[in-house]
Structures are given as C-alpha cells and as structure tokens.
C-alpha cells in the first residue's frame, strides 16, 4: 500500500487521467459481495433500480454484475490493478443499459440508465487489496470509494492509507 502523501499525489492524478480507448479491454460477469459476505442485489422498483446489501438465504441465486475493464493512461501503482503498467478503471452494470454511478453530492451510489460513451461518474479505479478483495475508487472524486453504510452502498471518503483496508470498502468478486 502507499503512504498518505502517495495517496494524495496518486488521487490528484486521477482527475486528469483519461481512458486510453473507448472500448473495454475485457469484461467479467461476477457476483459482488461485501467483505463480510453479504450480497449486493438489485431490484426493479417503480421503473428504477434499487441497490441492497443483504444476507441471502441458502441456495438463493446471487445477482450478477458485468465489470468492464478500461485502461487509463495514468500509470498504475502498487495498490491499483494494472495491465502493461497502466491503471485499470471499471464500470459496473447489473443489467443491460444500466450502470452504477457515483453521486458525489449525495454521497450515494445509484443505478442510471445511459448510453455510451459513459459519463465519468460511471468509472471507478480498481484496487486489488488483500484476501482477494477489491475496492472501487471514484474517478470523479479521488479518495472516495464505494462502501457499505446502513445496508446500502454509499460513497465513503478515505483520507489515509490505513483506511484503504477498512472492511466497509472491500468487496469480493465471484463467479457463483
């Protein structure tokens, strides 16, 4: 992991980082769960999607999310998951034409229907953390991560390197 000054220097550079190509380099269909093995689920309510963090009953099917990986021109660091020395950004889509968006004003994570090219609010820097966990840092607000708060996804400010490993911003990806 990197020190506090490293976080600040790195996150400042995020503001300027652009996606190398408009096309993802690869995609992966996975279920998303928290560090404590609660599932991230998506429910269609009143023509819009709600995001929940919940314990599923045994044998209950997990919702899948399509992670689309994009290369950034900004070099990767120790914590970021990179390819060919470039930082990786992801978008997350639980169903066709809907993507997770960072709402920085409300500190919330929302699902919005939109067309490509996607807005910056839909992009998150992927960090590979310990124990096969990942975290998602907002492209539009460096130092702010997708996290869990009161059984919902929320945006959580991380202001020191120690907090990069805090459980409420860590997620697990699995094929099952």
């Amino acid at each position: 992991a990197f020190g506090i000054s490293g976080v600040q220097k790195y996150t400042r550079a995020l503001h300027d980082s652009s996606i190398t190509g408009i096309s993802p380099i690869t995609e992966y269909l996975a279920s998303l769960s928290t560090y404590n093995d609660q599932s991230i689920t998506f429910a269609l309510e009143d023509e819009s999607y709600e995001i929940y963090v919940e314990d599923l009953k045994k044998d209950e099917k997990k919702d899948k999310v399509l992670l689309s990986y994009y290369e950034s021109q900004h070099p990767s660091n120790e914590s970021g998951d990179g390819v060919d020395g470039k930082m990786l950004m992801v978008t997350l889509s639980p169903t066709k034409d809907f993507w997770l968006h960072a709402n920085n004003k409300e500190h919330s994570v929302e699902l919005h229907k939109c067309e490509k090219p996607l807005p910056d609010q839909a992009f998150f820097v992927l960090h590979n953390m310990h124990s096969n966990c990942v975290s998602f840092e907002c492209k539009t607000d460096p130092g702010v991560f997708i996290g869990v708060k009161d059984n919902h996804l929320a945006l959580i400010k991380v202001d020191s390197s120690e907090n990069l490993c805090t459980e409420n911003i860590l997620f697990k990806l699995s094929e099952t």
């Epitope: 190509g21 408009i22 993802p24 690869t26």
Partner: antibody, heavy 128, light 108 residues
Framework: ELQLQESGPGLVKPSETLSLTCTVS??????????WGWIRQPPGKGLEWIGS???????YYNPSLKSRVTISVDTSKNQFSLMLTSVTAADTAVYYC????????????????????WGQGTTVTVSS | EIVLTQSPGTLSLSPGERATLSCRAS???????LAWYQQKPGQAPRLLIY???SRATGIPDRFSGSGSGTDFTLTISRLEPEDFAVYYC?????????FGGGTKVEIK
C-alpha cells in the same frame, strides 16, 4: 513480459486425439482479468477460433467444434490445454494459444473474444 | 454467425504510401467490437487495433482504425518496409467470433 508457448506432438493419426498445452510465463493465469484461448490456421488459410477459458475453468467453445473440444486449465502449473478428439486431415493446422479479452453481449448472454498476446504457434499434422 | 469480407484481397503499394483496408460485416453490430491483426509469414498474428479504433499497446500511430455498423477500415498512413504483411479483421460482438479472409499488403 507475458509470453505463451505451445507444446505437444506434431503428428497425430486420424481418429485419435490431439492434445496441446500452453505454458504462460511472465504473468499469472490466476491473477489475470483476461481469458485464455486456442486459435488455429490451416495451411495457406485464415484463422479459426477454437475456444476460450477463464482461470476458474469456465469454458466457451466454437459451436462448429464444440462436440470434439475440451479446454482445461491448471493454475498450479500456469498452463491451459486443448484436447480435440476424432481428428481428420481437416484438423491439420498451426495451433496458437493466446491471451484474450472477453466481451459480453447482453442480447444473447454470451461472451466473445479478441486475442491480444499470442504464442508462436505449433504445427500439427494429421496423417497415418 | 457474422461473416466478414475483406477487400481488396491484395494491395500492391510502395513504402511511404497510404494503405486503406476494408472489412465489411454481413450483419450490423452496435458495439464496435472489431479487431485488426497483422501476420507476417511464419509468425503468429499480432493485435493492432481493438474496439474498432483503439490501438493496442506498442502499436505505432501510423496504424488507425475506424468505422461502425457494417463497415470498418484499417488505415496505415505511411507504409514502412516492415508493414508488408497479411491483415485480418475479426468481430467479437457476437459468439462465435469470426475472422475475415485477410488482405495481403505487398510491395509494388
């Protein structure tokens, strides 16, 4: 630097099984966000995708070859393998292994692939 | 499956000239999931372009891709001696992925 190397017999008899292995060096199959695959090229002809695999073992095959193909992965050896049964002279080709980007199509709920790093290829001749 | 038709079959040009290679799909696809490869005799193909227009790592900027729907183009702005080879397009919008028949760029 990521490198892929194919290995296996260069001559296979008709009706027998073709077996090839691809060894990945300079990177881990397991930690990759990418997929892995096999492509072949008959003498003087174009390219044909055989199939792809994710490190978890999930496979994707060309429907035209699906009944005869098995692709498997051994993460402990950083290798993945191809088995093609009941071969004929039409299976004579240069066989390439490659790293692949996988892209999902929501409409038919399937993955398709492009190949960004290739092995040098190995020639397999089917003949008695 | 999507059939890709490349034209011309052979392109005879001199070093320094501009090469324009065409790839036409039998069905339209909205994703622009099209790749271009270069293959020299006795060698494996090398990825040049993915996503119709994104250059792969280490590919010189004289190579550019464009197009959408059914019509795609690979342009080599100024041919270098090492660019004379066979070029293949490939779609990965739908499974099974398919390749074009190739265009040979030869020295005039």
């Amino acid at each position: 630097e990521l490198q892929l190397q194919e290995s296996g017999p260069g001559l296979v008899k008709p009706s027998e099984t073709l077996s090839l292995t691809c060894t990945v060096s300079g990177g881990s199959i397991r930690s990759s966000i990418f997929y892995w695959g096999w492509i072949r090229q008959p003498p003087g002809k174009g390219l044909e995708w055989i199939g792809s695999i994710y490190y978890s073992g999930r496979t994707y095959y060309n429907p035209s070859l699906k009944s005869r193909v098995t692709i498997s992965v051994d993460t402990s050896k950083n290798q993945f393998s191809l088995m093609l049964t009941s071969v004929t002279a039409a299976d004579t080709a240069v066989y390439y292994c490659a790293r692949a980007g996988g892209l999902y199509n929501w409409n038919d709920e399937s993955f398709s692939f492009y190949m960004d790093v290739w092995g040098q290829g190995t020639t397999v001749t089917v003949s008695s | 499956e999507i059939v890709l038709t490349q034209s011309p079959g052979t392109l005879s040009l001199s070093p320094g000239e501009r090469a324009t290679l065409s790839c036409r799909a039998s069905q339209s696809f909205s994703s622009s999931y099209l790749a271009w490869y270069q293959q020299k005799p006795g060698q494996a193909p090398r990825l040049l372009i993915y996503g119709a227009s994104s250059r792969a790592t280490g590919i010189p900027d004289r190579f550019s891709g464009s197009g959408s729907g059914t019509d795609f183009t690979l342009t080599i702005s100024r041919l270098e001696p090492e660019d004379f080879a066979v070029y293949y397009c490939q779609q990965y919008d739908r499974s099974p992925l398919t390749f074009g028949g190739g265009t040979k760029v030869e020295i005039k």
